[in-house]
């Protein structure tokens, strides 16, 4: 198809040699007046549109990439010539830097309605260079993280060595949709909830004398919860005595809460008294049966194969450990009556 | 440090079978579940099989009948039987043990590749 009719958007990824980063293309899609497919929101030049103009009410993920040869040759499909870059719905995602990502790529619905959808394309050139600006070491990274509860801010990775001041007007984007109320370099979350993660787009223009062009970043937004300030503690045994049968198998449950960490080095361990003595038993391994974002659960069983005389003399003691401090809970065993 | 290392990737020919398997260190306990993932070029990671502590599996409707995934909690390993395989289970494979609510101790990934 003739790609000359196309609207056409120049987009600088200015990439970092130090970390892992990715990058993505929306298919921004024109809305001339004509074209219906193009045509999805109508929306008066002073309305911001909540989606991308390619997101609206119809399905508009059945868009068609391709990247145009440096050399001429016939355009290429992206799905099936570039393994490292990924179509999700509207979106190209290309999942390693490069300056080989450098080049032209245009996108266009696959079902072309009428004869004005031919036009209804867009290309994009992407220029990829790596970071060469050593003035501005502590960029912020592509992967930022967001403490669940507290006050937090995500900022622009190309922009994060700029005051607030000599910043210029940043578009923001939060998994494909416009922020349209965030125009600053850095974006300020009162309270962080799960919600708050995703992939974050920032998007400046700069401009010489020539032309203008868009300078992208992306970066990954996590929600993580802040390391615990507890001990662990145990949920089971609650009774320090415990009735027991003599001559009957006998196992006995330790299950212990313990809070999130990002370095976790739990200990859960059963170790025997004997009036001066003690030891540390042989038990089964540990096992979480209970993993939320907040805290693991974990259960390790000491297992007596008949309870005799002798263990209703001895403590059992249940041991448990985090970097914050240790709990113990002991079990005093008790011979049934009747 | 908790460790997952996968091994046993290679080329086969379709019809063929494959044991991965990981080995845990570092770890005091045995997570709430472990799994296998894989990431094939251009695509998105996707888990394949999951195995819980009590023993109980899931498995992903692609391989579901001709994976296996096991456990030997005194050896500290993980396996995945993979047989009958396909062109399209040609991907990274990843071993991952779940902590805090996800998935988040991952190995470094061992290649399958089927081809004739």
């Known amino acids: 198809f003739n790609i000359s009719g196309c609207s056409t958007k120049k987009l600088l990824w200015t990439y970092s040699t130090r970390s892992e980063e990715e990058f993505v293309l929306f298919c921004d899609l024109p809305e001339p007046q004509k074209s219906h497919f193009c045509h999805r929101n109508r929306l008066s030049p002073k309305q911001v549109p909540e989606h991308l103009p390619f997101m609206g009410s119809n399905d508009l993920s059945d868009v068609q990439w391709y990247q145009q040869p440096s050399n001429g040759d016939p355009l290429e499909d992206i799905r099936k010539s570039y393994p490292h870059i990924i179509q999700d719905k509207c979106t190209l995602h290309f999942l390693t830097p490069g300056v080989n990502n450098s080049g032209s790529y245009i996108c266009r619905p696959k079902m072309i309605k009428s004869p004005y959808d031919v036009a209804c394309c867009v290309k994009m050139i992407l220029e990829v260079k790596p970071q060469t600006n050593a003035s501005c070491e502590y960029s912020a990274s592509h992967k930022q993280d967001l403490l669940l509860g507290s006050t937090g801010s995500i900022s622009c990775p190309s922009l994060s060595c700029q005051s607030d001041a000599q910043s210029p007007a940043v578009t923001w984007y939060k998994n494909g949709k416009l922020l349209s109320v965030e125009r600053s370099n850095r974006i300020v979350v009162d309270e962080v909830y799960d919600y708050h993660q995703g992939t974050y787009v920032c998007d400046y223009t700069q401009s010489d004398t020539v032309s203008s062009w868009t300078v992208r970043a992306v970066v990954q937004v996590r929600t993580i919860v802040g390391d615990t300030k507890l001990k662990p503690d145990i949920l089971d045994p609650v009774e320090d005595t415990l009735e027991v049968e003599l001559g009957k198998p006998l196992t006995i449950s330790c299950k212990a809460r313990f809070g999130f960490e990002r370095v976790f080095n739990p200990v859960i361990k059963w170790y025997i008294k004997d009036s001066d003595l003690e030891w540390e038993v042989s038990v089964p391994e540990a096992k979480s049966i209970k993993s939320t974002l907040k805290d693991e659960i974990i259960e390790r069983n000491i297992i007596l194969e008949k309870v005799t005389q002798r263990d209703l003399r001895r403590k059992f003691v249940c041991f448990v450990q985090n970097s914050i401090g240790n709990t113990t809970q002991s079990v005093q065993l008790k011979e049934k009556r009747g | 440090q908790v460790q997952l290392q996968e091994s046993g990737g290679g080329s086969v020919q379709p019809g063929g079978s494959l044991r991965l398997s990981c080995a845990a260190s570092?770890?005091?306990?045995?997570?709430?579940?472990m799994g296998w993932f894989r990431q094939a070029p251009g695509k998105e990671r996707e888990r394949v099989a999951s195995i819980k502590t009590d023993g109980s599996t899931t498995y992903a409707d692609s391989v579901n009948g001709r994976f296996t995934i096991a456990q030997d909690t005194a050896k500290n390993t993980l396996y995945l039987q993979m047989d009958s395989l396909k062109p399209e289970d040609t991907a990274m494979y990843y071993c991952?043990?779940?902590?805090?609510?996800?998935?988040?101790?991952w190995g470094q990934g061992t290649q399958v590749t089927v081809s004739s």
């Open positions: 991952a043990a779940y902590q805090f609510g996800a998935f988040r101790v």
């Open positions: 570092g770890f005091t306990y045995i997570p709430a579940y």
